[in-house]
């Protein structure tokens, strides 16, 4: 199948459903990392850690992890942070196998979504609950605020920054202008002076097999940054693609199975069949990255209870000028090359 | 139904550039391939470039190379074609013309409906 | 490269005739060829692609057919609106694709 089964908790924020317990802070704004990426044993993904700041290793089976050390996305591993109750801060990478989830008496089905609070929306995958914050907090804004504070804002669920040099905060010119929003009731403030930002999608988290590429986007209600995932397949792991190149080519840019197959993720299987291309390969010094490609949203259905869609890379060209120079990471110069530009919608 | 509108005629001096654009609608150029064929007065149909879905990479022919560039810009689905150096050979009608992004399937579906260049001295 | 070369380079009929236009490539293309018809002051349209699959829109009248280095455009019961310059292509996976110089079909 296209997509191997595996959860999508592999990208959640680790959050704790007791509200009153302390829970020690995995990620550090501004971000700190090392002068150069880690070098990974073979078959390890380099992946952003879960903090979106820094190359890491990706933890393998059994290691710990944290919400900045996320578990290897594309080996169908996620954080089971049960064992770590009531914290939920420290976890063991674990692989899905697809059963359900009890949690205060409440059965759910693998692959059900449900909110125990205000504050967190939960997945149940195999048997354990992965939670990810509702209260989106991004960044302290780094550019014009030098004192920045997280507040409870009475008779809101989510904490705020505040800034205590408000008054040095530059005029921003209304591009995204959320009355709209208000008008409909989805917001309790205006944000007239919004300028509407989408970053591009990250690279696929993993060369082979199921990744996750994420994106920071404030075209919401309250103009907030947040966090927006897809799931990714730029090649399978499994198939030899250099055999399929034509004679006399050096590249099969873009590599597509014969047969239509249903996507599976948490044992959950996609309500409808696909038939996905794939970036290929170059016998030549050069890699394949997706250059045309769309995001689209794929239905699963559950073999128990309800099913679930998620959004999914899907490619349609690729293009192979880059050269390759870190087989874990071959993205990583990717925004400097002059020519490529992915149609990230 | 897929069209293709193209820039308008231009008359430019030999050794000058010429930057023709062709504008798609009808659909994306996240589905599919601009390429650009030129034909000179009473002569036959010339391919220039465009992206190679299996190579994966922007291919011209051998006589263009170094002198035209291709490039798609997807946030307007526009493309265009750019050629340097002019001669009085480059007098001809430029097409832009569609290629389905469909594993070994070169076939030009739709075309635009051309822009004379004329190389004057 | 592969060059096409199409024969007869102007053909002369009459509405209600069978016109008949071969196209050779230099080297085997399989079944990669296109037939394209151009008009005066217009821009091609594709006809046939794959050698013998029909575009879309275009009337049956038209057929191709042939493999590897020779093929054939058939035009049957010729309309007034046939009357046209039409253009083979090889669309094997190897650039640059290449056309045939092109067969007028004029009014007898």
């Known amino acids: 199948t296209a997509l191997s089964p595996t959860p999508t908790t592999m990208t959640f924020t680790p959050a704790p459903l007791e509200e009153t317990t302390t829970r020690p802070e995995f990620c550090k704004w501004p971000c700190e990392c090392p002068q150069s990426p880690p070098r990974c044993p073979l078959g390890v993904s380099l992946i952003t850690d879960g903090c979106e700041c820094c190359k890491i290793c990706a933890q393998q089976l059994g290691d710990n992890c944290t919400e900045a050390a996320i578990c290897d996305p594309h080996r169908g591993l996620y954080c089971d942070y049960s064992g770590d109750r009531p914290r939920y801060a420290i976890g063991v990478c674990a692989q899905v196998v697809g059963v359900g989830c009890v949690l205060d008496g409440v059965r759910y089905t693998n692959g059900e979504s449900f909110q125990p609070n205000c504050r967190y929306n939960c997945t149940c995958i195999d048997g354990t609950v992965g939670c990810t914050p509702l209260c989106l907090s991004p960044r302290p804004p780094r550019l014009w605020c030098r004192q920045p504070r997280h507040v409870r804002v009475p008779g809101q669920c989510c904490e705020q920054w505040v800034c205590d040099d408000d008054a040095r905060r530059p005029r921003q010119t209304a591009l995204l202008d959320t009355r709209a929003f208000a008008a409909s009731g989805a917001v309790e403030q205006r944000y007239e002076n919004c300028i509407a930002y989408t970053s591009p999608w990250s690279p696929c988290s993993t060369t082979c097999g199921l990744g996750i590429s994420t994106r920071i986007s404030n075209v919401n209600a309250r103009c907030w940054p947040e966090q927006e995932s897809r799931l990714c397949n730029l090649r399978p792991c499994d198939v030899d693609i250099q055999l399929h190149i034509k004679a006399g080519k050096k590249c099969l840019a873009v590599y597509q199975p014969e047969e239509a197959t249903n996507f599976t993720l948490a044992g959950c299987v996609s309500t409808r069949t696909y038939r996905p291309k794939y970036c290929g390969v170059c016998t030549d010094n050069r890699c394949c990255i997706p250059y045309k490609s769309k995001t689209i949203s794929v239905d699963f259905q559950c073999p128990e209870g309800p099913g679930f869609s998620r959004q999914v890379l899907w490619i349609n060209a690729c293009f192979c000028n880059l050269s390759c120079r870190n087989p874990n990471d071959i993205f990583a110069d990717l925004e400097s090359y002059p020519d490529f530009e992915e149609i990230a919608n | 139904e897929v069209q293709l509108v193209q820039s308008g005629a231009e008359v430019k001096r030999s050794g000058a550039s010429v930057k023709v654009s062709c504008k798609l609608s009808g659909d994306t150029l996240t589905d599919l391939s601009i390429h650009w064929v030129r034909q000179a007065p009473g002569k036959g149909l010339e391919w220039m470039g465009g992206f190679d879905f299996e190579d994966g990479e922007i291919v011209y022919g051998d006589k263009f190379k170094g002198r035209v560039t291709v490039t798609e810009d997807p946030s307007t689905d526009t493309a265009y074609m750019d050629l340097k150096r002019l001669t009085f050979e480059d007098t001809a009608i430029y097409y832009c013309?569609?290629?389905?992004?469909?594993?070994?399937?070169?076939?030009?579906?739709?075309w635009g409906q051309g822009t004379l260049v004329t190389v004057s001295s | 490269v592969i060059w096409m070369t199409q024969s007869p380079s102007s053909v002369s009929a009459s509405v209600g005739d069978t016109v008949t236009i071969t196209c050779r490539a230099s080297q085997g293309i399989r079944s990669w060829l296109a037939w394209y018809q151009q008009k005066p002051g217009k821009a091609p349209k594709l006809l046939i692609y794959g050698a013998s699959s029909l575009h879309s829109g275009v009337p049956s009248r038209f057929s191709g057919s042939g493999s590897g280095t020779y093929f054939t455009l058939t035009i049957s019961s010729l309309q007034p609106e046939d009357f046209a310059t039409y253009y083979c292509?090889?669309?094997?996976?190897?650039?640059?694709?290449?056309f045939g110089q092109g067969t007028k079909v004029e009014i007898k």
């Open positions: 013309a569609t290629i389905k992004d469909i594993p070994g399937r070169y076939y030009f579906d739709f």
């Open positions: 292509q090889q669309a094997d996976s190897f650039p640059p694709w290449t």
